[in-house]
């Protein structure tokens, strides 16, 4: 059966939106008015992985782009990147682990934990206009909580 996907946007708990800031980079900043259409639309696919009531494995692709968020080691540090894939083969139910995030719902907020690197989360900075990154701390300065907005296909 084909993998189930939905289209959505994400905002961090400070209401910063995510935009493409480079061919393989996202950043977070406050948008308003017409600028809101600049935010990236994700195609969130529900993939194979360890699942529980509040933890669901997903892959985060960019809608209509052959790009997925992935987690890799760079200079011995878990790092978030946008990775180009062959559209003929993606999305698929059994995604490679670097593409998988555990979507964790707590108090109507979402966290995205790397399946490859447990306790590392998709994060944004408090500061405006900074790259989205993989952070190894929760509850500190950096933001790991998001809200999801559904987008019609």
């Amino acid at each position: 059966a084909p993998v189930r996907s939905l289209n959505c946007t994400l905002r961090d708990s400070q209401q910063k939106s995510l935009v493409m800031s480079g061919p393989y980079e996202l950043k977070a900043l406050h948008l308003q008015g017409q600028d809101m259409e600049q935010q990236v639309v994700f195609s969130m696919s529900f993939v194979q992985g360890e699942e529980s009531n509040d933890k669901i494995p997903v892959a985060l692709g960019l809608k209509e782009k052959n790009l997925y968020l992935s987690c890799v080691l760079k200079d011995d540090k878990p790092t978030l990147q946008l990775e180009s894939v062959d559209p003929k083969n993606y999305p698929k139910k059994k995604m490679e682990k670097r593409f998988v995030f555990n979507k964790i719902e707590i108090n109507n907020k979402l966290e995205f934990e790397s399946a490859q690197f447990p306790n590392w989360y998709i994060s944004t900075s408090q500061a405006e206009n900074m790259p989205v990154f993989l952070g190894g701390t929760k509850g500190g300065q950096d933001i790991t909580d998001f809200t999801m907005q559904f987008v019609s296909s």
Partner: antibody, heavy 116, light 110 residues
Framework: SVEESGGRLVTPGTPLILTCTVS????????VTWVRQAPGKGLEWIGY?????SASYASWAKGRFTISKTSTTVDLKISSPTTEDTATYFC??????????????WGPGTLVTVSS | AYDMTQTPASVEVVVGGTVTIKCQAS??????LAWYQQKPGQRPKLLIY???TLASGVPSRFSGSGSGTEFTLTISDLECADAATYYC????????????FGGGTEVVVK
């Protein structure tokens, strides 16, 4: 809006910088593209300066052009122009609508003539 | 990669007639296609984006369709003011690309 400037007659090999001045939107949010059009020919994409500051180039343009920006301007440097670079150069804002890149609005263009 | 082939290169149409311009992408671009109109000596103007959405202020005589690799721009009830060159543009990828535009179609109105 966007408006180009700096186009002029130059001799081959003389570096030239074109400037795109933007107003009404932020270069922290929007990517800007450069496109050129040789006399009587079609539109040819040169490259982008992304909102994060990195540049992407058409495969043929790498090494020949450099795109950079300040808070309100985007520069296109033609490092060593040849007669083949004679064209009208346009800049445009890149709108990302559901991740799809669309060019709007466009500037009126600035003419570069390369001749000895 | 992502080469855009536009046909025909030129077409002559009578006032009130209909013209169809085709654009083919060498790889799947979903709905990531825009169409622009350029009149001689002027800047290009966005007509249609996301394959079929009309840009603000563009008359409904213009319509776009298609997805994947095959796309069409149709202009009906042609007016003299529609004489221009029309370009398609893929907006999906900017990596290792020669040109994001098709070669253009000149529409001559008789």
């Amino acid at each position: 809006s966007v408006e180009e400037s700096g186009g002029r007659l130059v001799t081959p090999g003389t570096p030239l910088i074109l400037t795109c001045t933007v107003s009404g939107f932020s270069l922290d949010v929007y990517t800007v593209t450069w496109v050129r059009q040789a006399p009587g020919k079609g539109l040819e994409w040169i490259g982008y300066i992304w909102s994060g500051g990195s540049a992407s180039y058409a495969s043929w343009a790498k090494g020949r052009f450099t795109i950079s920006k300040t808070s309100t301007t985007v520069d296109l440097k033609i490092s060593s122009p040849t007669t083949e670079d004679t064209a009208t150069y346009f800049c445009a804002r890149v709108k990302m609508i559901s991740n799809i890149e669309t060019f709007d609005p466009w500037g009126p263009g600035t003419l570069v003539t390369v001749s000895s | 990669a992502y080469d855009m082939t536009q046909t025909p290169a030129s077409v002559e149409v009578v006032v009130g007639g209909t013209v169809t311009i085709k654009c083919q992408a060498s790889e799947r671009i979903y709905s990531g296609l825009a169409w622009y109109q350029q009149k001689p000596g002027q800047r290009p103007k966005l007509l249609i984006y996301r394959a079929s959405t009309l840009a603000s202020g563009v008359p409904s005589r213009f319509s776009g369709s298609g997805s994947g690799t095959e796309f069409t721009l149709t202009i009906s009830d042609l007016e003299c003011a529609d004489a221009a060159t029309y370009y398609c543009h893929q907006g999906v990828s900017s990596s290792d690309i020669d040109n994001v535009f098709g070669g253009g179609t000149e529409v001559v109105v008789k």
